[in-house]
Interface confidence: low
Amino acid sequence: RKIPKVGHTFFQKPESCPPVPEGSMKLDTGIINENQRVSMSRNIESRSTSPWNYTVTWDPNRYPSEVVQAQCKHLGCINAQGKEDISMNSVPIQQETLVLRRKHQGCSVSFQLEKVLVTVGCTCVTPVVHHVQ
Amino acid sequence: GIAIPRNSGCPNSEDKNFPRTVMVNLNIHNRNTSTNPKRSSDYYNRSTSPWNLHRNEDPERYPSVIWEAKCRHLGCVKADGNVDYHMNSVPIQQEILVLRREPRHCPNSFRLEKILVSVGCTCVTPIVHHVA
C-alpha cells in the first residue's frame, strides 16, 4: 500500500504562532475549498432503486448551520416495474463530518468541534436472512 | 457567517455573525465514534450497486483516515448475481468538513477544509438521451 506522506506539518517558534491556551486550539472558520460543489449524477435521489428525500436541518448555534439529511422513502426497493419489492431493503448510507458547535453559558460563549453522522443517501441491499432453528 | 441569537441581558459586544477565528476546546465531541465503514456495516458487499472502500490517508488532516467508495460495476447486480447494464451504479458524494493545520507551522492552529468524498453507491435508472 502507498506510503502516506507526512509532509509539512512542522513546529514553529512559539513567538510566530498564535498564543493558544492549554486544552484549546485556534480555528479559522474560513473554509478551504469553500466553493467546491458536489457534481453527482442528476436527480439520483429520485432515480435510485432505493430513492430518498432530503431534509434540511437548521441550527443557528452550529457551523455550518444547514446540514442536509437523507431519508429512504421505502423499506424495500423499487423494481423494474416501478413497484416496491420488499424482498430487498433500502438502507441509509452514512458519513461523518465535523461541525463547530457554539455553546452559551450565561453571557460567555464557548466553541467545540463535534463529529456528526450525516445520512447521505440510500442503497438497495439483499437482506440478511436469520434462520430460526 | 451565521447569525447567532444572543441572550438579551448580555453586553452587546460580540458580532452577531459566526466569528472568522475562534478558540475551540480540543476535546472533539464524539471523537471516538467508529470511522471504519467496513466495521460498521457490510452494505458495500450486499448492495445491488456494490463498492470497494479505499483508505485515503493524510496525517496532516483530521480525521487522518477517510474511506472513499468506488463503484465495482457500471451496471447493477441482479438477484442471480449477474450485472444488469440497463441500470447504472453511481457514487453518492458528500461534502464534509475536516481540519487542516494552518498556518502550517503552528501545532495548535487549524482551519476548516471542505472535501468531497464518495460515500457509497446506489443503483439508478439511466437517463436516456433520444437522438432526434
Epitope: I3, P4, K5, V6, G7, H8, T9, F10, F11, E22, G23, M25 | L26, N27, I28, R31, N32, T35, P59, E60, R61, Y62, P63, S64, V65, L99, R101, H105, P107, N108, F110
Partner: antibody
Framework: QVQLVESGGGLVKPGGSLRLSCAAS????????MTWIRQAPGKGLEWISY????????YYADSVKGRFTISRDNAQNSLYLQMNSLRAEDTAVYYC???????????????WGQGTTVTVSS | AIQLTQSPSSLSASVGDRVTITCRAS??????LAWYQQKPGKAPKLLIY???SLESGVPSRLSGSGSGTDFTLTISSLQPEDFATYYC?????????FGGGTKVEIK
Amino acid sequence: QVQLVESGGGLVKPGGSLRLSCAASGFTFSNYYMTWIRQAPGKGLEWISYISSTGGNIYYADSVKGRFTISRDNAQNSLYLQMNSLRAEDTAVYYCARDGGVIISTAMFDYWGQGTTVTVSS
Amino acid sequence: AIQLTQSPSSLSASVGDRVTITCRASQGISSALAWYQQKPGKAPKLLIYDASSLESGVPSRLSGSGSGTDFTLTISSLQPEDFATYYCQQFNSYPLTFGGGTKVEIK
C-alpha cells in the same frame, strides 16, 4: 512540566514477551500522538511505532510489525508497548516520545522519556 | 524507506571551532528534516525542525540548512556542552527514519 516515564523493561529470553509502559504528566495526554523509538546498544535511533490521540490510527516499522502492539489509555495518561516473540535484535533502550502536534501528527518529537532497557538473551 | 546517511560518523574538534555535519537523504524530502542532540545516557533533544528552524530554547550558534536531499547542521562556535551525538530525522513519509548519527568529540 512535561514528563514521560517509561517502565517494564528487563531481561527476557528469545520468544518471550514484555509490556512496556509510559506514564505521561504535565500536558493533556489525550490530545497528542505518541510514539516509541528504540536504540540498540552503541547504535542509532530507530522509530518503531506511533499511535494517534484517540488510538484509532497506528503505524509500525516493518521490523516489529505483527510482533509489537502499541496502545494507550487516555484515562490513565499511559502509553503501552506489548512486545511478543522477542528476538536478540530487539535488545535496546526503548523511549516513549510525544509528537509535537495537537490533533494532527507532526512526526517530530519534542519531549522524550529517559528510556527503559530491554535485553533479549538466552 | 527513505535512508538518511550522516557524515562524518565522528569528528574531533576544539572549543570555538566551527563544525559542520551533513545528512543526505536517499530521495527528495523537501525540507521535512529535524536534528536531535543526544548526550550519553540521556534521551535525544530536538534542536532543529523544517531543516532550518531553531527549536525554542536552542542557542543560535546552531543552524540548519538544506532542502531536497542534502542537509547541513552547523555549530558556529563549539561550546563544551555541544560535545554529543547528533542525529537527523526525516518526517516526509513513513516509516520515519533517522541518520546513523555523528559523534562530536573533544580534540
